[in-house]
């Protein structure tokens, strides 16, 4: 028998520095977690102790903090090189700055293979990107050979900016021939490494003949065997075992997100490459693991540019940006409108001639808006200003909801109106009218939504049985502020871009902004 140790990360989302337990900015260092300096310490400790070790990343290193905003992927290449990653799969967020924003900072600079079997380049891009990412890579590990085959969510064109010259194929259809090719090369130990979410990971384990292990990402899935060491609640045991259609037991793993854990899986193979046993658990990277001084020094050196960036002007406002609680938790506020407009603008994807865009709606809890911005400071808006407005380090995500769920959400928005509570919704692409004289749960008297399948966008009444795409904060997608119906009833959830980054990009693009209060949210009394 031959033993392989797979160390894995996924959805790190730009958390190069250590973070607090909830993966936001580190405040009390003695209780902080993760970060590449701490990860390096643990990885090297395992590499010293065990003979056959692979360090893999399942995508979405890009996007999530000011590190990505400023360094645009150069930081990913630099620190992943320093940690000696063995391979990485492309995630949807790797395309956030377009194909060029992937090629130049990451694909050309990475000293490890970057993989995806289901992304096919066409047109002029085909020759430009040729060889910069691969469908698979055969890696030497000890005296054996391990094949790693990559995959990426086929929803990427709706979630990011891959452009028109990349085709995202069905994962299973694309993976099978690559695995078959590896088999013909006498590679009998094969890991599928990819970024399509836990449900697809399990399907790959079930359907793709010859895959021995699946290492996934995208759904931020936390798996654990035994008592979990922090706040994350396991979605199942680690590894999660899937019985394949040809009767094999295939371990499937994922390691939550944000570099908080290092996935640790030990696989035992027989001489024919069959998995005999698999066991392990994610390792919580808490403060009991010291930060490596060399990597930490490097981080501190790279940090200097971030501090300078946060005070630079992004754009100007010629109006007061009202982000006060008195406004945003009670009525339509222009800061809410600005943020929602930025959220929609960030999700413009013309992927179908029938649709002007794939999504037109935004909802945003008023309690998530934490500060106004005064225009009397020469109109200047900086990253620092926006960090005061959106201090929680969240993301603006894409969900699919039924009209009936949206209706419940808007009822929840005003079910205890008047108490300055955070659940009051700010909106974009939605016109809502509330009648507060009615009993809670029956206060939404009009709810019109902007069409997407139209050449001239207009507002139509919400249909209860129709499925709608909506952009909202991850906080709401996870049921925050009492929006349990969103969490329970959402049909799909894809994590999006860092909230501050979305707004800062929009302001930089617009240069001068003047958001108004324009009747998106109205109150009425009496009959309708």
């Amino acid at each position: 028998a031959w033993e392989l140790t797979i160390l894995h990360t996924n959805d790190v989302h730009s958390r190069l520095e250590q973070t607090s337990e909830d993966s936001s900015k580190c405040v009390n260092a003695s209780r902080c977690m993760g970060g590449v300096a701490r990860l390096f310490t643990k990885v090297q400790q395992i590499r010293r102790a065990e003979p056959n070790v692979l360090l893999l990343d399942a995508g979405d290193q890009y996007q999530g903090t000011i590190w990505f905003t400023v360094y645009k992927g150069a930081e990913v290449a630099h620190f992943m090189n320093a940690l000696r990653y063995d391979a990485m799969a492309l995630g949807n967020h790797e395309f956030d700055n377009g194909v060029e924003g992937l090629i130049e900072p990451l694909l050309k600079e990475a000293k490890f293979p970057i993989l995806s079997a289901n992304i096919k380049a066409k047109g002029p891009l085909a020759s430009q990107i040729s060889g910069l990412y691969l469908p698979y890579k055969v890696l030497p590990v000890g005296d054996e050979v391990v094949g790693i085959v990559g995959y990426t969510s086929k929803e990427t064109p709706f979630l990011s900016n891959p452009g028109t010259n990349l085709v995202f194929e069905d994962e299973i259809t694309a993976l099978q021939p690559e695995v078959d090719k590896l088999k013909t090369l006498n590679v009998n130990k094969i890991i599928a490494l990819g970024h399509s979410g836990f449900e697809m990971d399990k399907l790959i384990a079930q359907k793709v003949r010859g895959v021995d292990v699946v290492v996934g990402g995208h759904s931020n899935t936390f798996l654990y065997t035994g008592n979990p060491p922090s706040k994350e609640v396991p979605a199942g045991k680690y590894p999660f075992i899937v019985t394949s259609d040809d009767g094999r037991k295939v371990p499937v793993v994922q390691a939550y997100a944000f570099g908080k854990y290092l996935g640790y899986l030990k696989i035992e193979f027989d001489e024919r490459g069959n998995v005999i046993s698999s066991h392990g658990n994610p390792i919580l990277l808490n403060s009991s693991i010291p930060e490596d001084p060399s990597i930490k020094a490097d981080i501190n050196k790279w940090r200097i540019k971030l501090d300078n960036y946060s005070t630079q002007e992004l754009g100007k406002t010629i109006v007061y940006l009202d982000g006060s609680s008195q406004s945003c938790r009670f009525r339509e506020c222009n800061m809410g409108n600005l943020i929602c407009d930025a959220m929609i603008n960030n999700n413009l994807r013309h992927t179908d001639e029938m649709f002007w865009n794939h999504v037109s709606m935004c909802i945003l809890n008023g309690g998530g808006i934490r500060s106004p911005i005064d225009e009397r400071n020469n109109g200047t808006i900086t990253w620092e200003n926006l960090a005061a407005v959106l201090p929680f380090g969240g993301t603006f995500d894409l969900v699919q909801l039924k009209g009936s769920t949206l209706k419940k959400a808007f009822e929840h928005s005003v079910h205890r109106y008047g108490q300055s509570t955070g659940e009051f919704l700010q909106v974009g692409g939605i016109h809502v009218v509330y009648d507060l004289s009615r009993k809670p749960g029956d206060r939404v008297v009009k709810l019109d939504v902007l069409c997407t399948k139209c050449r001239v966008p207009s507002y139509d009444p919400l249909k209860m049985d129709e499925v709608y795409k909506v952009i909202l904060p991850n906080f709401l997608a996870n049921g925050g502020d009492g929006f349990q119906m969103i969490k329970d009833e959402l049909l799909r959830h894809d994590s999006g871009d860092q909230d501050i980054n979305v707004v800062s990009t929009y302001i930089s693009k617009m240069k001068v902004i003047y958001p108004a209060v324009e009747g998106r949210i109205k109150f009425s009394t009496g009959s309708h």
């Epitope: 390096f40 090297q44 590499r47 010293r48 090189n81 320093a82 000696r84 990653y85 063995d86 391979a87 990475a110 000293k111 490890f112 293979p113 055969v138 890696l139 030497p140 000890g142 005296d143 054996e144 050979v145 090369l185 006498n186 490596d292 060399s294 990597i295 490097d298």
Partner: antibody, heavy 121, light 107 residues
Framework: QVQLQQSGPELVKPGASVKLSCKAS????????INWVKQRPGQGLEWIGW????????KYNEKFKGKATLTVDTSSSTAYMELHSLTSEDSAVYFC??????????????WGTGTTVTVSS | DIQMTQSPASLSASVGETVTITCRAS??????LAWYQQKQGKSPQLLVY???TLADGVPSRFSGSGSGTQYSLKINSLQPEDFGSYYC?????????FGGGTELEIK
């Protein structure tokens, strides 16, 4: 430009030890492995081992375990190889070489100038 | 350990000729193979890596090929500066062994 400058020739007595140096310039020292290679007069090349300067992580050819010890000093961007209990078999030119990549594309892209070690009483 | 057998051990050729040096591995090295040139009293220089990728600045008359256990280095239209020793090296499982070398001399 990228260079690996090695220390000068050494004449040492059997049973003694010697420490060779390899000073890197023109690139980020901590980002690449430093490998050491032995070449006996008129013979081929033999890989001794490598060190990752970032944290001193080493990998040795089993044949040279106990014979060679690899270390680095990142403040001076210098790699060292100490050879122990020298015999005439250790008389050779020793090269340091930079290795590109990790498990991506592997090769020694930059070689040092070489240090001649002569073991003689 | 994987052994690398290089042939021929020595070779005489004239300027303008084409020569091929071969390297056989005792096990599959999966294209993790490099070729180096070494002149008398000098350090080796990288020519080819990944069995067939030409290193920066290496003239196009050099080319690498092969897979599995059999690899070769071809030099088209030999130039005076091409004479010297050539070594293959695998980067599969450690130890990363070199071939015994091929001495290419002027006829």
């Amino acid at each position: 430009q990228v260079q690996l400058q090695q220390s000068g020739p050494e004449l040492v007595k059997p049973g003694a030890s010697v420490k060779l140096s390899c000073k890197a310039s023109g690139y980020t020292f901590t980002s690449y492995d430093i490998n050491w290679v032995k070449q006996r007069p008129g013979q081929g090349l033999e890989w001794i081992g490598w060190i990752y300067p970032r944290d001193g992580f080493t990998k040795y050819n089993e044949k040279f375990k106990g014979k060679a010890t690899l270390t680095v000093d990142t403040s001076s961007s210098t790699a060292y190889m100490e050879l122990h209990s020298l015999t005439s078999e250790d008389s050779a030119v020793y090269f340091c070489a930079r290795k590109e990549g990790y498990r991506g594309d592997w090769y020694f892209d930059v070689w040092g100038t070489g240090t001649t070690v002569t073991v003689s009483s | 350990d994987i052994q690398m057998t290089q042939s021929p051990a020595s070779l005489s050729a004239s300027v303008g000729e084409t020569v091929t040096i071969t390297c056989r591995a005792s096990g599959n090295v999966h294209n993790y193979l490099a070729w180096y040139q070494q002149k008398q009293g000098k350090s080796p220089q990288l020519l080819v890596y990944n069995a067939k990728t030409l290193a920066d600045g290496v003239p196009s008359r050099f080319s690498g090929s092969g897979s599995g256990t059999q690899y070769s280095l071809k030099i088209n239209s030999l130039q005076p500066e091409d004479f010297g020793s050539y070594y293959c090296q695998h980067f599969w499982s450690t130890p990363w062994t070199f071939g015994g070398g091929t001495e290419l001399e002027i006829k």
